[in-house]
């Protein structure tokens, strides 16, 4: 799995219009990231949640369904 | 700093096949996806690349099944393999490095090339 | 496939001359393009990555900007060794697509 900072398990906001910058809090990260919409060669990135783009680092980030963790929301959550 | 080196020049026949290695040094090799992009006088054209957090490779549709590209993580070596070679293939082959660990975005290293010349 | 088209396909510029080369995109790509410089018998260099942002050891004097399908590279004073090719390029979905090139050349 990545980091935290670059693919955050738990979920934040996500970008209204997937043209357009937001700004979010992880919350695990406890920092504010820029986000856009992720390229769409992502779109097989997130196994099971939606993919975001952490602006600064050039990387991906997944937000995951309910019940999903992993950097790749690849893992069923066994507490869910 | 990360370098690039190509294997030498090549000349080959029509419907043979070239296999072009890009040995890597500098850097670590399996962060980062490696790609292979070619000009010929048209420009500059993506054959495709490999990314090491999925570890396969992805061709663009033009070259699918023709092209080949693979690494060898324990030499830090990429190769890419194109047959049924005609005319047309003659071109500049390069290998470029991606900025990205996780896809294919800036090639911010670059091979320096190796030219291909497929003449009967 | 997304297809980049540059324009113009070259220019004559004088040392000191502010350049303009733009590249449109097909489809909206956000801002997920790349802008290379390329010499003769070289291989390409990158100078702006993500639209807008200058590639380490590149001169300030390379600015990028543009979002969606309308993107321009400009170089604020043109020198000597700026004469060369220069490639647009989206990375926004595969495959990976180059613009035709902007030849630079000396007036």
């Known amino acids: 799995d990545g980091n935290s900072t670059r693919s955050p398990e738990t979920n934040g906001l996500l970008c209204g219009d997937p043209e357009e910058n937001c700004a979010a809090t992880t919350t695990q990260s406890k920092r504010k990231g820029h986000f856009s919409r992720c390229p769409k060669q992502y779109k097989h990135y997130c196994i099971k949640g939606r993919c975001r783009f952490v602006v600064a680092e050039q990387t991906p980030s997944c937000v995951c369904d309910e019940g999903y963790i992993g950097a790749r929301c690849e893992r069923v959550d066994l507490f869910y | 700093q990360v370098q690039l080196v190509q294997s030498g020049a090549e000349v080959k026949k029509p419907g043979s096949s070239v296999k072009v290695s890009c040995k890597a040094s500098?850097?670590?090799?399996?962060?980062?996806?490696i790609s292979w992009v070619r000009q010929a006088p048209g420009g500059l054209e993506w054959m495709g690349g490999i990314?090491?957090?999925?570890?396969?490779?992805n061709y663009a549709q033009k070259f699918q099944g023709r092209v080949t590209i693979t690494a060898d993580e324990s030499t830090s070596t990429a190769y890419m393999e194109l047959s049924s070679l005609r005319s047309e293939d003659t071109a500049v082959y390069y290998c470029?490095?991606?900025?990205?660990?996780?896809?294919?975005?800036?090639?911010?290293?670059w091979g320096q090339g190796t030219l291909v010349t497929v003449s009967s | 496939d997304i297809q980049m088209t540059q324009s113009p396909s070259s220019l004559s510029a004088s040392v000191g001359d502010r350049v303009t080369i733009t590249c449109r995109a097909s489809?909206?790509?956000?801002?997920?393009l790349n802008w290379y410089q390329q010499k003769p018998g070289k291989a390409p260099k990158l100078l702006i990555y993500?639209?807008?942002n200058l590639q380490s050891g590149v001169p300030s004097r390379f600015s990028g900007s543009g979002s969606g399908t309308d993107f321009t590279l400009t170089i604020s004073s043109l020198q000597p060794e700026d004469f060369a090719t220069y490639y647009c390029?989206?990375?926004?979905?595969?495959?990976?697509?180059f613009g035709q090139g902007t030849k630079v050349e000396i007036k």
């Open positions: 470029a490095r991606s900025s990205s660990t996780y896809g294919i975005h800036a090639f911010d290293y």
């Open positions: 500098g850097g670590t090799f399996n962060d980062y996806a």
């Open positions: 990314i090491p957090i999925f570890g396969n490779a």
């Open positions: 489809q909206s790509i956000s801002n997920f």
């Open positions: 993500a639209a807008s």
């Open positions: 390029q989206q990375y926004d979905d595969f495959p990976m697509t």
